[in-house]
């Protein structure tokens, strides 16, 4: 039975040209996290394997940095980066947990961080 929950940074906004940290946290389970994947819509941005480390997709290596922790840093943001991002936790024995973050990249300097929320 999957008892865990993923807490994410939720709906967030950031300025064009700036950077943003995408963060997820898995709680309420004793399952072993074996790998975390970060995805944007249908594209795999990065893999963080618990034993074998971080691997950034060649398509994103210039604008994506690992961490902090299991999070992901997006740099040199453009308006095209607006959209849904997913953290996918592969765990044993529970299986897969998925968290969703919506990022809006703004032209102006009024970007504010959204509230944190939970996805069961």
């Amino acid at each position: 039975m999957m008892t865990g929950t993923i807490e994410t940074t939720g709906n967030i906004s950031a300025e064009k040209g700036g950077s943003i940290i995408l963060q997820c946290h898995l709680s309420s389970t004793t399952a072993q996290v074996t790998q975390v994947n970060w995805e944007q819509q249908d594209q795999l941005l990065a893999i963080c394997n618990a034993d074998l480390g971080w691997h950034i997709s060649p398509s994103f290596k210039d604008r994506v940095a690992p961490g902090p922790g299991l999070g992901l840093t997006l740099q040199s943001l453009t308006v095209n980066d607006t959209g849904e991002y997913f953290c996918i936790y592969h765990t044993y024995p529970d299986g897969t947990y998925t968290g969703r973050i919506f990022l809006e990249v703004l032209e102006s300097s009024v970007a504010e961080h959204g509230a944190r929320f939970q996805i069961p």
Partner: antibody, heavy 119, light 107 residues
Framework: EVQLVESGGGLVQPGGSLRLSCAAS????????MSWVRQAPGKGLELVAT????????YYPDSVKGRFTISRDNSKNTLYLQMNSLRAEDTAVYYC????????????WGQGTLVTVSS | DIQMTQSPSSLSASVGDRVTITCKAS??????VSWYQQKPGKAPKLLIY???TRHTGVPSRFSGSGSGTDYTLTISSLQPEDFATYYC?????????FGGGTKVEIK
């Protein structure tokens, strides 16, 4: 030059134990996660264990979980695989392997050591 | 676990032929795929990672492509040293699993 040299294979009876070693050189061993991959005679490849750089995290597929233990001694630049309760289906060549720097694939492999489980 | 199904399991080809090997994943693995070459009695050699990136020193006749569940390794002009067995591997989820292999033999 990266070098991985396995040893410790041999013939063992079903239910027996064996410990494999992999001596690493040519890179900073303590900075890399490591893996063991096996290949049964005439068959494909199977990843059987992984360990992080400091030995604090390990992973095993269900096929060997509870029977195999991966460990490392960073002071000796050596990776180990302790295999207990061995079965005939564990007969294989066992390779230690390391991912390439910045490559999502096993770029470095040892020559392999053969483990035969038979009565 | 994700199953990686390679086809064909073996093929016969001549030097200079264009050879295509396919690997089908049991679920979307989003380009987290690598390819290896193995010769008898030797360890595998990494050819391609992230579905299409050639590893250092790999000849340009080897190329990889694909997305979703379907991936391809192509040898544009088969050379005598290319007769070997080829394996795909997925890294999308643990355990990282391999395909069953494709043996490329001399016609």
């Amino acid at each position: 030059e990266v070098q991985l040299v396995e040893s410790g294979g041999g013939l063992v009876q079903p239910g027996g134990s064996l410990r494999l070693s992999c001596a690493a050189s040519g890179f900073t061993f303590s900075s890399y996660g490591m893996s063991w991959v096996r290949q049964a005679p005439g068959k494909g490849l199977e990843l059987v264990a992984t360990i992080n750089s400091n030995g604090g995290s390990t992973y095993y597929p269900d096929s060997v979980k509870g029977r195999f233990t991966i460990s490392r001694d960073n002071s000796k630049n050596t990776l180990y695989l302790q295999m207990n309760s061995l079965r005939a289906e564990d007969t294989a060549v066992y390779y230690c392997a390391r991912l390439g720097t910045g490559t999502l694939g096993f770029a470095y492999w040892g020559q392999g050591t053969l483990v035969t489980v038979s009565s | 676990d994700i199953q990686m199904t390679q086809s064909p399991s073996s093929l016969s080809a001549s030097v200079g032929d264009r050879v295509t090997i396919t690997c089908k994943a049991s679920q979307d693995v989003k380009t987290a795929v690598s390819w290896y070459q193995q010769k008898p009695g030797k360890a595998p050699k990494l050819l391609i990672y992230w579905a299409s990136t050639r590893h250092t020193g790999v000849p340009s006749r080897f190329s990889g492509s694909g997305s979703g569940t379907d991936y391809t390794l192509t040898i544009s002009s088969l050379q005598p040293e290319d007769f070997a067995t080829y394996y795909c591997q997925q890294h999308y989820s643990t355990p990282w699993t391999f395909g069953g292999g494709t043996k490329v033999e001399i016609k």
